[in-house]
Interface confidence: low
């Protein structure tokens, strides 16, 4: 079952996906697609990386983190209700049926009417290197001592706006489990 995450219309949605490269720059191809992960590849590809770079994307979809270190989290700019649905992050590890597949459910809510716009935080800047992926070695050094390791088997994506004062609430709302 997919873990469910939320963003509001007009915000940027953030869908984390991580792996640990054998060495920095020794990358594994990754594809992102709209729809659940099929047997091979990604359906309705929105972004793809190869062994060197981002080599395909569609408008509004991009990687905000350091994908050279395995952060292949997807940012969707200025989301609309039509962006709701399942997204597949597929880490294309060489070999037969070795791919790591993560299905992430994005739910878009109508925008709240607020008197003034709230400042968005860049998750990768505010909370660097927090997540690790299943079966790819230990997490990197934690930068937030108050938070234990969050594993990608438990959380496949986080809400885009993780503000200091609402971190616990946002994690709870997203369905994440903190060990």
């Amino acid at each position: 079952s997919e873990v469910e995450y939320r963003a509001e219309v007009g915000q940027n949605a953030y869908l984390p996906c991580f792996y640990t490269p054998a060495a920095p720059g020794n990358l594994v191809p990754v594809c992102w697609g709209k729809g659940a992960c099929p047997v091979f590849e990604c359906g309705n590809v929105v972004l793809r990386t190869d062994e060197r770079d981002v080599n395909y994307w569609t408008s509004r979809y991009w990687l905000n983190g350091d994908f050279r270190k395995g952060d292949v989290s997807l940012t969707i700019e200025n989301v609309t209700l039509a962006d709701s649905g399942i997204y597949c992050c597929r880490i294309q590890i060489p070999g037969i049926m070795n791919d790591e597949k993560f299905n992430l459910k994005l739910v878009i809510k109508p925008a709240k009417v607020t008197p003034a716009p709230t400042r968005q935080r860049d998750f990768t800047a505010a909370f660097p290197r927090m997540l690790t992926t299943r079966g790819h070695g230990p997490a990197e050094t934690q930068t937030l001592g108050s938070l234990p390791d969050i594993n990608l088997t438990q959380i496949s994506t986080l809400a885009n706006e993780l503000r200091d004062s609402r971190l616990a609430n946002d994690l709870r709302d997203s369905g994440a489990t903190i060990r």
């Epitope: 720059g25 060197r52 395909y56 994307w57 991009w62 905000n64 350091d66 270190k69």
Partner: antibody, heavy 114, light 110 residues
Framework: QVQLVQSGAEVKKPGSSVKVSCKAS????????IYWVRQAPGQGLEWMGS????????NYAQKFQGRVTITADESTSTAYMELSSLRSEDTAVYYC???????WGQGTLVTVSS | QAVVTQEPSLTVSPGGTVTLTCASS?????????PNWFQQRPGQAPRALIY???NRHSWTPARFSGSLLGGKAALTLSGVQPEDEADYYC?????????FGGGTKLTVLG
């Protein structure tokens, strides 16, 4: 190792269109992104757009949106870049590139002159 | 569309060290912009040197290194050779488009 061979030089009239081809050999054409980059005489490089042949969908730089069409024919391992409504400032060498911009064609000079 | 700015020209002596930079009109350049660097000699197609900030291609000499410096992407040439005289371009990814810098003409004295 993929090699890219481009079509020959073209001379075009203002207002017309040009279609430049880029044929790949020696590798898996379909899964590589093909990029198109141009360089006006004495000027810098300008990224125009790209396509992954296996997907068929192209992305374009904002500047060229509506005037450029990038296509690919998997059966002949050839990518195409068509630029319409040509003007004199479109005079440039047009390059195709692949494999994350590591492999480049030899370039095609397009001259727009009345 | 974003504008990517490089030094128009730089001069260096053989054996010296020089750093070329690449700035974005949108703010600090991070690894998320996947900076690439290219060398272009007169009459030739560009040649890729560095990808994703600091990774050399197999054909790139070790004297070329990429980094992030003060909110810009940087290309440093150490122990410059006469054959390094060329134009150098950076290329940044903006989640919907790649944008080249204006290029730096590197002159090697002597």
């Amino acid at each position: 190792q993929v090699q890219l061979v481009q079509s020959g030089a073209e001379v075009k009239k203002p207002g017309s269109s040009v279609k430049v081809s880029c044929k790949a050999s020696g590798g898996t054409f379909s899964s590589y992104t093909i990029y198109w980059v141009r360089q006006a005489p004495g000027q810098g490089l300008e990224w125009m757009g790209s396509i992954i042949p296996i997907l068929g969908t192209a992305n374009y730089a904002q500047k060229f949106q509506g005037r450029v069409t990038i296509t690919a024919d998997e059966s002949t391992s050839t990518a195409y870049m068509e630029l319409s409504s040509l003007r004199s400032e479109d005079t440039a060498v047009y390059y195709c590139a692949s494999a994350s911009h590591t492999i480049w064609g030899q370039g095609t000079l397009v001259t727009v002159s009345s | 569309q974003a504008v990517v700015t490089q030094e128009p020209s730089l001069t260096v002596s053989p054996g010296g060290t020089v750093t070329l930079t690449c700035a974005s009109s949108t703010g600090a350049v991070t690894s998320g912009y996947t900076p690439n660097w290219f060398q272009q000699r007169p009459g030739q197609a560009p040649r890729a040197l560095i990808y994703t900030t600091n990774n050399r291609h197999s054909w790139t000499p070790a004297r070329f290194s990429g980094s992030l410096l003060g909110g810009k992407a940087a290309l440093t040439l150490s122990g410059v050779q006469p054959e390094d005289e060329a134009d150098y371009y950076c290329l940044l990814y903006y989640g919907g488009a790649w944008v080249f810098g204006g290029g730096t003409k590197l002159t090697v004295l002597g």
